[in-house]
């Protein structure tokens, strides 16, 4: 039938950061190609990445339609050059992915400190509100737009001259912290979704220190 050497995909894995979402699987194809289908629990199957020799498929366009839905994908295997051929049961071989709920599971990308400004003994640290691929009314939403108050940021800061660290939290994208006059400080931030049980925290942002061009100092 031409399907003898066709193998089902396995190790189907969702890789998702800030809603950019790719399904990956194995094995690398030998004399076969793949097609991916995705649906919500209650929806119809939609085909993507037709007859591909890749072992990944970007499903971002589908999941951003409703990031709070739960999605299921499946990967079909076909003999190369004979994609009409089916398995012994009259169906092409396929394997299901784990379920995936983007809002609960997408990884939080590494945040970036946009700026910091010192006014006297206060420093305002601003975290960049990263744009996602989630759309509303033809506009791309930011991470804050999507998560609202479910998203907090943790700031770590310390004097350049010392190892003692302090921390602060915000449910906006700004911190206003007290500092000692005449001291330089370094900053790093982390995104957190406290209500989650998995993928709760991002990696730390790159460290930014006062005295570098990103910040601004004003003596009032």
């Amino acid at each position: 039938s031409g399907t003898t050497n066709t193998v089902a995909a396995y190790n189907l894995t969702w890789k998702s950061t800030n809603f950019k979402t790719i399904l990956e699987w194995e094995p690398k194809p030998v004399n076969q190609v793949y097609t991916v289908q995705i649906s919500t629990k209650s929806g119809d199957w939609k085909s993507k990445c037709f007859y591909t020799t890749d072992t990944e498929c970007d499903l971002t366009d589908e999941i951003v339609k409703d990031v709070k839905q739960t999605y299921l994908a499946r990967v079909f295997s076909y003999p190369a050059g004979n994609v009409e051929s089916t398995g012994s049961a009259g169906e092409p071989l396929y394997e299901n992915s784990p379920e995936f709920t983007p809002y609960l599971e997408t990884n939080l990308g590494q945040p970036t400190i946009q700026s910091f400004e010192q006014v006297g003994t206060k420093v305002n640290v601003t975290v960049e509100d990263e744009r996602t691929l989630v759309r509303r009314n033809n506009t791309f939403l930011s991470l804050r737009d999507v998560f609202g108050k479910d998203l907090i940021y943790t700031l770590y800061y310390w004097k350049s001259s010392s190892s003692g660290k302090k921390t602060a939290k915000t449910n906006t994208n700004e911190f206003l912290i007290d500092v000692d006059k005449g001291e330089n400080y370094c900053f790093s931030v982390q995104a957190v979704i406290p209500s989650r049980t998995v993928n709760r925290k991002s990696t730390d942002s790159p460290v930014e220190c006062m005295g570098q061009e990103k910040g601004e100092f004003r003596e009032i």
């Epitope: 770590y156 660290k165 302090k166 921390t167 939290k169 915000t170 982390q190 406290p194 925290k201």
Partner: antibody, heavy 117, light 107 residues
Framework: QVQLLESGAVLARPGTSVKISCKAS????????MHWVRQAPGQGLEWIGG????????MYDPKFQGRVTITADTSTNTAYMELSSLRSEDTAIYYC??????????WGQGTLVTVSS | DIQMTQSPSSLSASVGDRVTITCKAS??????LSWYQQKPGKAPKLLIY???SLADGVPSRFSGSGSGTDYTLTISSLQPEDFATYYC?????????FGGGTKVEIK
């Protein structure tokens, strides 16, 4: 289910150190923050410090800075608190607690540290 | 450092009474405030997180309100098992600070 199991009671001499462990189960400490709080007999709760096991950042109340070290071993899912130069005023129950970002939502059973000569 | 002023330090009440405990922060803590109940010989137990959210398994007679610097814990109808000491905690900025506690006793 989530549990924090602390090491047993300690009797220590003034000037020595004590290291208390807090073994977590039911969650990965790397996904949370771990804190230490103490309560002297008949007194209120006092924050000692905390640690982010994912990146090693530790924060301390200035009152304890230089005397306390908070660490975590992610391979064993265990948080630690070491307090040095002990004095009689350090006699207290020491609690570890998990910080979700919204609250310290789970607490250990407490470890009684008695400092006496 | 942020100071937390909790009041009253103690109160006497009867079963069925409505009880209110307040915590005032020395600066805006952006709702990073939680409330705990502690009984003698036991670890503190979380009641309210993020100022207003009820923790899992906590009876609905407990509620939290407030924002900015002023926060309140209310017990709508005091039950026998509610006689205990209550603490607020600000965790918006280190060093984290607890209120001094409120001991709720039987009248």
């Amino acid at each position: 289910q989530v549990q924090l199991l602390e090491s047993g009671a300690v009797l220590a001499r003034p000037g020595t150190s004590v290291k208390i462990s807090c073994k977590a189960s039911g969650f990965n400490i790397k996904d949370y923050y771990m804190h230490w709080v103490r309560q002297a007999p008949g007194q209120g709760l006092e924050w000692i410090g905390g640690n982010d096991p994912a990146n090693g950042h530790s924060m301390y109340d200035p009152k304890f800075q230089g005397r306390v070290t908070i660490t975590a071993d992610t391979s064993t899912n265990t948080a630690y608190m070491e307090l040095s130069s002990l004095r009689s005023e350090d006699t207290a129950i020491y609690y570890c607690a998990r910080d979700s970002g919204y609250a310290m939502d789970y607490w250990g059973q407490g470890t009684l540290v008695t400092v006496s000569s | 450092d942020i100071q937390m002023t909790q009041s009253p330090s103690s109160l006497s009440a009867s079963v069925g009474d409505r009880v209110t405990i307040t915590c005032k922060a020395s600066q805006d803590i952006k709702s990073f405030l939680s409330w705990y109940q502690q009984k003698p010989g036991k670890a503190p137990k979380l009641l309210i997180y993020y100022a207003t959210s009820l923790a899992d398994g906590v009876p609905s007679r407990f509620s939290g309100s407030g924002s900015g610097t002023d926060y309140t814990l209310t017990i709508s109808s005091l039950q026998p098992e509610d006689f205990a000491t209550y603490y607020c905690l600000q965790h918006g900025e280190s060093p984290y600070t607890f209120g001094g506690g409120t001991k709720v006793e039987i009248k």
